[in-house]
């Protein structure tokens, strides 16, 4: 298949090239391949440019594209049976080298859905238009072609080679062509960076003359991360040219001797390298040693470095990079510490705030104040909690066993409590008898009166109503007459009540409330102490408290 | 397998130059580091330099520096450590060494011998 | 140059007792890819030495897992954690971040 090789960029540790060529997609991957490359990623706005860079590179030396609208296939491809997912930047597509799912991308136009058929991304190029920084080739969407029918408007292909690092273009100070062969076989006079593994021929003199000099070099790793020729001295130097021709190959400055030879040298706080060509900071800093946030501190005069970390961090074992330091194991906290990234932050136990004397201190909620209390009706404050009570006559419900409801004494267990009628009252109850009937003394009996065709006797009177303020159950007076063994209506109770004697108050059992540790109480948001971060305090999330539900085993709550 | 060999044991006189050979197989010699190594009687290790047998490009430890020549044949794979106006303290046993992609010194020769003695 | 302190000159361990060597580095060996240039080195008498770990921490092929290397960015250790008769030598430290390649001075490992 023909696909020639018109332009490369190389820069970072990539090289681009692109290719003219009327190929399918998958075509195009495979002459990537083959030199060790896959069809270019596009995977932020930076790495658009370089691609544009080498079509523009491509565009200028090919005069026979057949289509304005020119198309050139990129390594985004969606494999058949995937579908569209409009969530995602790529779509979907995938980058055909592997890799994450990038932010950038560049759609040319709404994508339809499509499952049936793998799809493939090509670049597009309207070539009636120059080629701008600002207007980056769109992305098209389509089918993937075939061989001999590579898709509408398809005239190449852009490939991606990446790389250990990369060698600086060699400095010639006299005349003479450098021709650099890359791995991936591309021949070229002029790289800006030069792939690891490639191979560079110097052949020195004028051209028109005989050649006096050739060079061969490689580029290689000199140590962990370097990247050099090895090559020293200006290349091609020439006495009749000295420093004039290209700053004499040098770097920085060129000094001339008298004898037409000359020497590299560097500005002041640069030193010359072992190549005698290239200049580099004095400053140990200039290299980035730091890592993790760490700043770059000069030693005295210059000579050497430190590492500074921001407050929170410090330097770990390599004196390089920086780590949290976890301020919790200094336990300044009351109660519970928090370590986060650069600083801390206090928490208080359910039941309990910030405050009290010292840092990070905590003191008790009084969950019983005034305007704050949970309870319905009676309430203690305890150390890290509460306990709720009600009157007599009532007793604690509701989920969170904050609430009191009244007990229906008609209804209570051991018996009924009245000879005959049972009327219910707000905290309290009556008896009363049918017609025919009187109460006796002791309330609870009834004894035989006069005739009477008026209502049972015995209704609550106005002033037994509304005993239980504060009750959220409300309940209206009720009668509940059942027959006795004599055939007289009695009470049916339904809950388990002592037998009532006028000094046996009815009291209710405190309320549990326990922590957050999956049991049920009374839950409170940690509330923060302080935090000393890099960023500044942070606000809790904190809240009002929410209330779990009660625990009937009489115990006081607990944090 | 990598296998780096070297030429015998020599004595010479003070004054006198040397070259030892390495002959590497088993992998690809233009393309890794070839380095020497010094050992002086009873003593610990010392770089000396090293040749990149893919282009003849070397690097010498300044303490050796204009004393050692390092060179290499890249059709016979083999490395050459050439010592010049020997001295009674250049007796030691020299090592060429490859270098390998995590820079570590991964096979080592066997060692030459040279003795320096009026 | 990269100086390089090795400790202690010679070391004598019980069999199947563990044993420890130190080198300090007058410079970090961390390089800014995230990888420490610091390898340990084995020599029995009369051989060439053997690389036995690279880069810190990793084992060289066909060495026994007895052996480890620990350390930070200018201290490090080597490790032999149930000391072998075949372990008697003299182990080196080296550094390879930055030329001239530099040695410790060597430390000797024998049997008590």
């Known amino acids: 298949t023909g696909a020639d090789t018109e332009a490369v960029v190389c820069v970072g540790t990539a090289c681009y090239t692109a290719h003219s060529g009327k190929l399918s997609a998958a075509e195009a991957q495979n002459h990537c391949n083959q030199n060790g490359g896959n069809l270019a990623t596009v995977k932020s706005k930076e790495e658009a440019q370089h691609v544009q860079r080498v079509l523009a590179q491509l565009l200028r030396r090919e005069a026979a594209l057949t289509a304005r609208m020119s198309k050139f296939w990129i390594g985004l491809q969606r494999e058949k049976g995937k579908c569209l997912d409009p969530s995602l930047p790529l779509k979907g597509f995938s980058w055909v080298g592997g890799g994450e799912d990038t932010p950038y991308s560049n759609w040319h136009k709404e994508l339809r859905n499509s499952c049936i058929s793998k799809r493939c991304v090509s670049l597009l190029l309207d070539l009636s238009q120059p080629l701008l920084p600002s207007r980056l080739p769109k992305w098209s969407e389509g089918p993937c072609g075939s061989p001999g029918s590579p898709g509408s408007n398809i005239e190449g292909f852009v490939c991606k080679f990446s790389f250990k690092g990369m060698c600086r273009p060699l400095a010639l100070g006299g005349p003479g062509q450098v021709t650099y062969t890359t791995p991936f076989q591309t021949t070229s006079s002029s790289l800006e960076a030069v792939p690891f593994a490639s191979a560079a021929n110097v052949a020195c003199g004028e051209g028109d003359k005989d050649e006096t000099q050739s060079h061969y070099f490689l580029c290689k790793e000199k140590a962990p991360d370097v990247f050099d020729w090895g090559s020293s001295g200006p290349l091609c130097v020439s006495p009749k040219y000295g420093c004039n021709f290209n700053n004499g190959g040098c770097h920085q400055d060129c000094f001339e001797g008298g004898d037409g030879s000359f020497l590299c040298g560097c500005r002041p706080g640069f030193r010359l390298l072992d190549d005698l060509v290239t200049c580099a900071s004095r400053n140990p800093c200039s290299s980035s040693p730091c890592r993790g946030g760490a700043t770059c501190v000069l030693g005295p005069h210059g000579k050497n470095y430190t590492c500074r970390c921001p407050q929170g961090y410090q330097l770990d074992s390599s004196q390089l990079d920086c780590v949290d330091v976890d301020e919790c194991q200094d336990s300044p906290c009351a109660q519970e510490c928090v370590n986060t990234p650069g600083g801390f932050r206090c928490e208080c136990w359910v039941g309990y705030e910030p405050g009290g004397p010292g840092e990070g201190a905590c003191q008790d909620v009084d969950e019983c104040a005034l305007g704050r209390s949970p309870c319905a009706q009676g309430c203690t404050n305890t150390d890290g909690s509460f306990h709720c009570s009600c009157e007599e006559g009532y007793v604690l419900a509701g989920e969170d066993g904050t609430q009191c409801q009244d007990v229906d004494e008609c209804v209570g267990p051991g018996g009924p409590l009245c000879d005959s009628l049972c009327f219910n009252t707000q905290g309290s109850f009556h008896c009363g008898c049918l017609p025919g009937w009187v109460l006796a003394p002791n309330g609870v009996s009834c004894t035989m009166g006069p005739v009477s065709l008026g209502p049972p006797s015995g209704p609550p009177d106005e002033e037994d109503k509304g005993e239980k303020e504060g009750s959220t159950v409300p309940r209206a007076a009720t009668a509940s007459p059942t027959r006795g063994p004599e055939g007289t209506p009695k009470a049916t109770p339904t809950t388990s009540r002592p037998s009532l004697s006028s000094d046996a108050p009815i009291t209710s059992a405190p309320l549990k409330m326990l922590a957050p540790s999956g049991s049920p109480g009374v839950w409170r948001e940690p509330s923060i102490h302080h935090a000393t971060a890099a960023s500044g305090p942070q606000e809790p999330a904190g809240g009002d408290s929410s209330v779990a539900t009660q625990n009937n085993d009489g115990t006081d709550g607990q944090k | 397998q990598v296998q780096l060999v070297q030429s015998g044991p020599e004595v010479k006189k003070p004054g006198e130059s040397l070259k030892i050979s390495c002959k590497a197989s088993?992998?690809?010699?233009?393309?890794?580091?070839l380095n020497w190594v010094r050992q002086m009687p009873g003593k610990g290790l010392e770089w000396m330099g090293r040749?990149?047998?893919?282009?003849?490009?070397?690097d010498y430890n300044g303490k050796f520096k204009g004393q050692v020549t390092i060179s290499a044949d890249k059709s016979s794979g083999t490395a050459y450590l050439q010592l010049s106006s020997l001295k009674a303290s250049d007796t030691a046993v020299y090592f060429c060494?490859?270098?390998?992609?995590?820079?570590?010194?991964?096979?080592w020769g066997q060692g030459t011998l040279v003795t320096v003695s009026s | 140059d990269i100086v390089m302190t090795q400790s202690p000159d010679s070391l004598a361990v019980s069999l199947g007792e563990r044993a420890t060597i130190n080198c300090r580095f007058s410079?970090?060996?961390?390089?800014?890819?995230?990888?420490?240039?610091l390898y340990w080195y084995q020599q029995k008498p009369g051989q060439p030495p053997k690389l036995l770990i690279y880069?810190?921490?990793n084992l060289a092929s066909g060495v026994p897992d007895r052996f480890s290397g620990s350390g930070s960015g200018t201290d490090f250790t080597l490790t032999i954690s149930s000391l072998q008769a075949e372990d008697v030598a003299v182990y080196y430290c080296?550094?390879?971040?930055?030329?001239?390649?530099?040695f410790g001075g060597g430390t000797k490992l024998e049997i008590k």
């Open positions: 060494v490859r270098g390998d992609g995590y820079w570590a010194m991964d096979y």
């Open positions: 088993g992998y690809a010699f233009s393309s890794y580091w």
């Open positions: 040749i990149y047998p893919g282009d003849g490009d070397t």
């Open positions: 410079k970090s060996l961390l390089h800014s890819n995230g990888i420490t240039y």
């Open positions: 880069q810190m921490s």
């Open positions: 080296a550094q390879n971040l930055e030329l001239p390649w530099t």
